[in-house]
Interface confidence: low
């Protein structure tokens, strides 16, 4: 039932995050008269759409409407009816759809077209569905966490306590891990960004920011696993793959056609004398780590320094918020505590990966086996990516904060995306021209 009390002078916005493994709908709310204040927008609802990511609907686009129904109906319930028509809805698709577009632009367009038609049927102000770039994904994630942490303004914040308080306005870097890509975004210290593709310039609340960002397509946790399997099966002597990234006693049959379905495994593709192979877990962290490192080409760097695969990366600077799958995986492994050193994380991963599969299944009976089986790989991958990929050290590890929510709002790109598209981040302080969408795309 709708509340008939005096109408609050508030506004709402909806963003759908169409990721590679699933879609989530976020509803944001803010006081109408404080649109340009920093820190006033907050998340009131998250609805996870049941089913896979939208790129998986390529052969069954007619099911997309039903797929989105539950969460869109939830939005109808949460947002007062009087506000429906003026509530903007945005859908941003990320790396799963980027990969589909690489395979076929036509198929990707077809999926987006059906998504748009489905979302247009609701009484909201639908503003479009699009595939956002990796650069945007990194930039919006960086904006989200710094907005929520109150880094863009000296003014009093609407909430009482900011976690990760550092008593200064130095921004946090953003580390985002998805299923198909991973982003690193931060303000380097007095460092020229040697590659123009990785440079962003913003003016927010009267201050200029020179930001470095890069999105590594195919290096999200799910695609990294496909890459690793494709690489390792090349040298397997038969259709048995003894894999150190899965628990001892774990077994799973993989179709070779599924392995080579993604563009991410193309560089490892070869003709195999079998249609299927069986993964047999041996649960060895050190060997798993070594196997993962082979996915990072560190032998070539045309810049003063690189992350991997010849991509420029300036020296790391300041604190970082690590969110999305960085957080979910580390949370499951109970390794998000600020007290846990990198050495302790490694030690815990060694113990975890070595636990027999039957024991793990018993210990985590409520967790779906598909997800449960991959935590050893995912945790090891996170360590490998952060340490060898991005060059964090045992000492700088303490500057990584694994963040799920900040004051009730999920850390991720969606809030930054909405703030930008609704012109709620002014370039000047206190009120002036809002940041235009073209400023950093």
């Amino acid at each position: 039932t709708q509340n008939k009390a005096l109408p609050e002078n508030v506004k709402y916005g909806i963003v759908l995050d169409a990721g590679s493994s699933h879609t989530s709908l976020y509803i944001y709310k803010w006081p109408a008269e404080k649109e340009n204040d920093t820190g006033v927008v907050h998340q009131v609802e998250e609805c996870r759409v049941k089913g896979p990511g939208i790129s998986k609907f390529v052969q069954k686009v007619n099911e997309i409407g039903i797929y989105l129904t539950d969460c869109m109906e939830r939005a109808r319930e949460v947002i007062p009816r009087s506000q429906h028509q003026e509530t903007p809805v945005y859908l941003g698709a990320t790396a799963g759809m980027r990969l589909l577009r690489m395979e076929s632009e036509e198929l990707a367009d077809r999926v987006l077209d059906v998504v748009e038609r489905s979302l247009s049927n609701y009484p909201f102000d639908f503003q479009g569905a699009r595939i956002i770039t990796g650069q945007e994904e990194g930039a919006y994630g960086w904006i989200t966490i710094n907005y929520l942490l109150g880094k863009f303004s000296q003014k009093t914040r609407w909430f009482s306590i900011v976690p990760y308080e550092t008593n200064n306005q130095e921004t946090f870097g953003a580390l985002d891990l998805g299923g198909a890509s991973t982003q690193v975004t931060f303000v380097p210290q007095n460092q020229t960004i040697e590659s123009p593709d990785n440079a962003l310039q913003f003016r927010l609340y009267g201050k200029d920011y020179n930001v470095y960002t890069h999105s590594f397509l195919c290096y999200g946790k799910d695609q990294a696993l496909w890459q690793k399997l494709a690489k390792d099966i090349q040298v397997a002597s038969n259709e048995i793959l003894r894999d150190p990234c899965f628990h001892p006693g774990y077994k799973k049959v993989v179709n070779v056609s599924d392995l080579y379905k993604t563009p991410c495994t193309k560089r490892f593709e070869m003709t195999l004398p079998f249609q299927q192979f069986e993964i047999q877990g041996i649960g060895n962290y050190q060997q798993c780590h070594q196997s993962i490192l082979e996915l990072f080409n560190t032998s070539y760097c045309p810049y003063s320094q690189c992350a991997f695969n010849g991509i420029f990366l300036p020296p790391l600077q300041g604190d970082f918020g690590a969110f999305s799958a960085f957080y979910f995986v580390m949370k499951f492994l109970n390794l998000t505590s600020e007290k846990v050193s990198q050495e302790k994380v490694t030690e815990m991963m060694k113990k975890f990966c070595a636990q027999p599969w039957e024991e793990i299944k018993t210990s985590y009976a409520g967790v779906k086996e598909k997800y449960l089986s991959e935590y050893c790989f995912s945790g090891t991958y996170i360590l490998s990516l952060l340490l060898q990929g991005y060059h964090f050290t045992a000492d700088s590890w303490e500057h990584i904060h694994f963040i799920g929510k900040i004051q009730g709002s999920d850390a991720g790109w969606t809030l930054g995306y909405m703030l930008n598209l609704t012109n709620m981040i002014p370039a000047e302080q206190p009120l002036s021209t809002p940041l235009s969408h073209s400023t950093y795309v």
Epitope: F332, N334, L335, S337, K339, V340, K344, T362, S363, V367
Partner: antibody, heavy 119, light 109 residues
């Protein structure tokens, strides 16, 4: 090898305060949550509270909230527990203990400090 | 506070199985992890961790000790019992800060 060495036994009068120290060697106290647990003669273990020496943040059991103060000194790698308004029922052995990863192994315990409250 | 209730005492012959139970007032599971630990304490000594996370054996502890359970009901099993196992045994939750059970006194007949 990490070791926790506590201060010696104390005898106090009712109404007085006692301050017990716990010096850690072999690792920095900032790597841990430091807990205090007490045990009255012939009784069970009773958790009193913990301190996060990295940020001087404390959490106390409801029962002790108004009487206990936990502090730390990172320069000497020592944590302290002060209990005020002592009464005879506070006679107990007081232990300090580390907790590195919340919910995982409690790595180390001190040898205990006997505090006797008697008039 | 999460209240933990233990069986108070147990007498068992060497070579037999000893089963100590602990019930929690509310669940100590969180995100698939069970925050239940078991300690052994002998007179004049600090407690010694035996089992953490309900079923993981602490380093240096003999495999005769095992832990099981989830949610609100937990068991510490010693099989086979040895004379040296005479001690008090405590369950402890660390899901929400710490709380200890009242202890179970195990005597070897």
């Amino acid at each position: 090898q990490v070791q926790l060495v506590q201060s010696g036994a104390e005898v106090k009068k009712p109404g007085a305060s006692v301050k017990v120290s716990c010096k850690v060697s072999g690792d920095s106290i900032t790597a841990y949550f430091m807990h205090w647990v007490r045990q009255a003669p012939g009784k069970g273990l009773e958790w009193m509270g913990r301190i996060d020496p990295d940020h001087e943040r404390t959490k106390y059991a409801e029962k002790f909230k108004n009487r206990v103060t936990m502090t730390s000194d990172t320069s000497t790698n020592t944590v302290y527990m002060e209990l005020s308004s002592l009464r005879s029922e506070d006679t107990a052995v007081y232990y300090c203990a580390t907790e590195r990863v919340p919910g995982f192994e409690t790595d180390y315990w001190g040898q205990g400090t006997m505090v006797t409250v008697s008039s | 506070d999460i209240v933990l209730t233990q069986s108070p005492a147990l007498a068992v012959s060497p070579g037999q199985r000893a089963t100590i139970t602990c019930r929690t007032q509310q669940t100590v599971d969180h995100y698939g992890t069970t925050y239940m630990n078991w300690y052994q304490q002998k007179p004049g000594q600090p407690p010694k961790l035996l089992i953490y996370l309900a079923s993981s054996l602490a380093s240096g502890v003999p495999a005769r000790f095992s832990g099981s359970g989830s949610g609100t009901d937990f068991t510490l099993t010693i099989n086979p019992v040895e004379a040296d196992d005479t001690a008090n045994y405590y369950c402890q939750q660390s899901r929400n800060l710490w709380t200890f059970g009242g202890g179970t006194k195990v005597e070897i007949k």
